[in-house]
Each structure stands twice: as structure tokens, then as C-alpha cells.
């Protein structure tokens, strides 16, 4: 009897183990005792990335401008084309199907990371002695003014969105 | 260890007969077909035989069909080639090769080999 | 039966070099080819099979490229234990053929 399973990147059909078509081609006909699997290379808008059976190729993805997408790396016979977001958006999905604006961090927040093709931004909250009074996704936190340094006094003291005010010392006469 | 070990080569008159042994070790023998390969002196490889996992599957070269016979013992992990009326012109090393495949004697590749044994016919 | 050849017959280069081989087939094969090496009184080893799959061990400098009917061995930079010679064959029909072999010499 025929056996049940065929070594790796091979098929059983007909009592044949069939080798697979190799990534970036497609199956044409199955082996038979005397000829091997017929296989033909995927065109040049297609591809197939794995040891396959397949009898057609799949089409690369399509980065829609229209959608905010634009083309990271071409695709090959054996890759699809990888698609990311235009400048100012970032993908929706790990597949990366449509784009969305980044996010700003609002007042009292700072951008712990910038925003990529394929992530949004990071906020952080602003800790004790630092600061941020925009709406940005670009902005870090920022330090507190030093009122020493400059030789002057905290007269209005800093939150989480707002800076210290400096004013001078009380001179004693 | 993985290995082939053919033996029964030797110098043989023409028209007389001999028998080749490959011995098998390492690899589960009856999970792939098996072949002959032979090289004349200081010539290119020639595929002689192949014999699938089964024996159900069985071919030859041209050159030598109706002379040799494959065959190979699972039990034993031995693949055996009976050569008769040999002709000068079967003069060669004659390896036995593993093919990572299983279903036909016909086609197929090598991806383990003997170190082979000298056949000379020769008066 | 399909015919291989083999070009060139043999090729003198130094340690360092790359070396190309060529294999042309007398009917498409897809990619159903292998390439092997032999030195003097051993036996044939695999490199490559499916035109472009390295075989386990082997080393990366070692590449196959092509489909159909043309395919290409190359070696990117020859070391002193590749001087042998090299070997094509198609498994895409009956029966399996070789070509002539390429003889890799030192220049």
C-alpha cells in the first residue's frame, strides 16, 4: 500500500508523493510516476510565499492612495507588496488595510513615542516637575523652569500643564 | 551514523554476471526509494536503476535493461543490483544513492551516497 | 530523454574568486534540478536541489539560481576544499540525467 504521508514539501495524489511547486510558482499539473510536478512562476503583479499546490497565484496587495497608503517594499514572486501610511497616519490594523491621523497628546500629556508608518503616538502623563500646555504629537514633557538658577522665586507654582512662575525675591530694606 | 556501504565489485569477464550490495544505516530504509548510479573511468555520472520504498515501482536505463535487476530487503535495510551479461562498457563505480522521495523508481534525486564500488569486465 | 549541458567543461580560478556554472536543459524542467559536488574517488555530494534550496550543511556561499530550461551554480568566493567537480541534474522526468560536469581547477 501507498503511504500515508509524504515527506516535507511533498503531496500525496494518486499514490504519488508529488513534490510541492516552490514559493513564487504555481501548479500546473501533478507529478506522475515519470514526470515530476509541473510548475510555472507566478507573474509579475503575483505571488505565492510558501511550498504550494496552488493552480493560481495571489495578486499583490494594491497600497491605495486613497486610503493613505503608499508602498514600503515592492512585492516579489514569492512576497506581497507591504504597504504603510503616509506621512501623519499610521496603520489601522497589523495588516495594514487603511490609515488614520496620529494622535496628539493632549495638555497635561507628552509624547513618549513618536508615531510611525504602522503605530500611533504614545502619551505619557507629565509627573511631578514637568509639563505640557499644547496639544502635540511631537512634544515631550518638559522640565519645570528653574527659578534658583535664574535667581529668582517660584511665585505661582507649576502643574502638570503649566510652568512655574518666576518672580523676583523680596528684598528686606 | 547515516551511511551507505555497497560491496560486491571486482574484475568480471564479459558476458559473466555479479551481484551488488548497498547496506543502509541511520535512516529508515523503507521510507524511500533507492538507486544506481554509476561513473566510468574518468567519465560523468550515469543514473542506472531506481526502485521505490514498496519495489513497486522498478526502472532502468536503456543501457542496461534486460541485463540488471534491482531490488532491495527492508528487512535487511539492503538494496541489491544482479548484473549479467556484462559488456566492457559497464565498467565503472557504481554507487548506491538515497532519494529524499518514496513513491517512484523513475525520476527522483540523491541526497545520500556510498563511496561506491569498482565493477571491471574485462577479458 | 532531456539532455543537460554543462558550460564550461572547466574553469581555472583562484581562492577568493566567483565562480559561475551554467546548466542548460533540452526541455523545461520547472525547477526540478539538483547540483553536486565530487572530489577525486569520492562520492557525488548534494548542494543544492530544487534549482535554488540549499541542502542542510552546506555552506552559503554556495547558491543556485534559474527555471525552465537555464540554471546557474555560483560560488561567491572559492575556497581551497571547493576545487572538485560539479555536477547538474534534472529530476523533472524519466529518466534522471546529468550533465557533463564542470571542472573547478587552480589557477
Known amino acids: 500500500e501507498p503511504p500515508t504521508a509524504c515527506r516535507e514539501k511533498q503531496y500525496l495524489i494518486n499514490s504519488q508523493c508529488c513534490s510541492l511547486c516552490q514559493p513564487g510558482q504555481k501548479l500546473v499539473s501533478d507529478c506522475t510516476e515519470f514526470t515530476e510536478t509541473e510548475c510555472l512562476p507566478c507573474s509579475e503583479s503575483e505571488f505565492l510565499d510558501t511550498w504550494n499546490r496552488e493552480t493560481r497565484c495571489h495578486q499583490h496587495k494594491y497600497c491605495d492612495p486613497n486610503l493613505g497608503l503608499q508602498v514600503q517594499q515592492k512585492g516579489t514572486s514569492e512576497t506581497d507588496t507591504i504597504c504603510t501610511c503616509e506621512e501623519g497616519l499610521h496603520c489601522t490594523s497589523e495588516s495594514c488595510e487603511s490609515c488614520v491621523p496620529h494622535r496628539s497628546c493632549l495638555p497635561g500629556f507628552g509624547v513618549k513615542q513618536i508615531a510611525t508608518g504602522v503605530s500611533d503616538t504614545i502619551c505619557e502623563p507629565c509627573p511631578v516637575g514637568f509639563f505640557s500646555n499644547v496639544s502635540s504629537a511631537f512634544e515631550k514633557c518638559r522640565p519645570w523652569t528653574s527659578c534658583e538658577t535664574k535667581d529668582l522665586v517660584v511665585q505661582q507654582a507649576g502643574t502638570n500643564k503649566t510652568d512655574v512662575v518666576c518672580g523676583p525675591q523680596d528684598r528686606q530694606r | 551514523e547515516v551511511q551507505l556501504v555497497e560491496s560486491g565489485g571486482g574484475l568480471v569477464q564479459p558476458g559473466r554476471s555479479l551481484r551488488l550490495s548497498c547496506a543502509a544505516s541511520?535512516?529508515?530504509?523503507?521510507?524511500?526509494?533507492m538507486h544506481w548510479v554509476r561513473q566510468a573511468p574518468g567519465k560523468g555520472l550515469e543514473w542506472v536503476s531506481g526502485?521505490?520504498?514498496?519495489?513497486?515501482?522498478?526502472h532502468y536505463a536503456d543501457s542496461v535493461k534486460g541485463r540488471f535487476t534491482i531490488s532491495r530487503d527492508n528487512a535487511k535495510n539492503s538494496l541489491y543490483l544482479q548484473m549479467n551479461s556484462l559488456r566492457a562498457e559497464d565498467t565503472a563505480v557504481y554507487y548506491c544513492a538515497k532519494d529524499p522521495t518514496a513513491t517512484t523508481g523513475a525520476r527522483g534525486y540523491f541526497d545520500l551516497w556510498g563511496r561506491g564500488t569498482l565493477v571491471t569486465v574485462s577479458s | 530523454d532531456i539532455q543537460m549541458t554543462q558550460s564550461p567543461s572547466s574553469v581555472s580560478a583562484s581562492v577568493g574568486d566567483r565562480v559561475t556554472i551554467t546548466c542548460r536543459a533540452s526541455k523545461v524542467i520547472s525547477s526540478w534540478l539538483a547540483w553536486y559536488q565530487q572530489k577525486p574517488g569520492k562520492a557525488p555530494k548534494l548542494l543544492i536541489y530544487?534549482?535554488?534550496y540549499l541542502e542542510s550543511g552546506v555552506p552559503s556561499r554556495f547558491s543556485g539560481s534559474g527555471s525552465g530550461t537555464d540554471f546557474t551554480l555560483t560560488i561567491s568566493s572559492l575556497q581551497p576544499e571547493d576545487f572538485a567537480t560539479y555536477y547538474c541534474q534534472q529530476h523533472s522526468s524519466f529518466p534522471p540525467t546529468f550533465g557533463g560536469g564542470t571542472k573547478v581547477e587552480i589557477k
Open positions: 530544487a534549482a535554488s
Open positions: 541511520g535512516f529508515t530504509f523503507d521510507d524511500y526509494a
Open positions: 526502485i521505490s520504498w514498496s519495489s513497486d515501482s522498478i
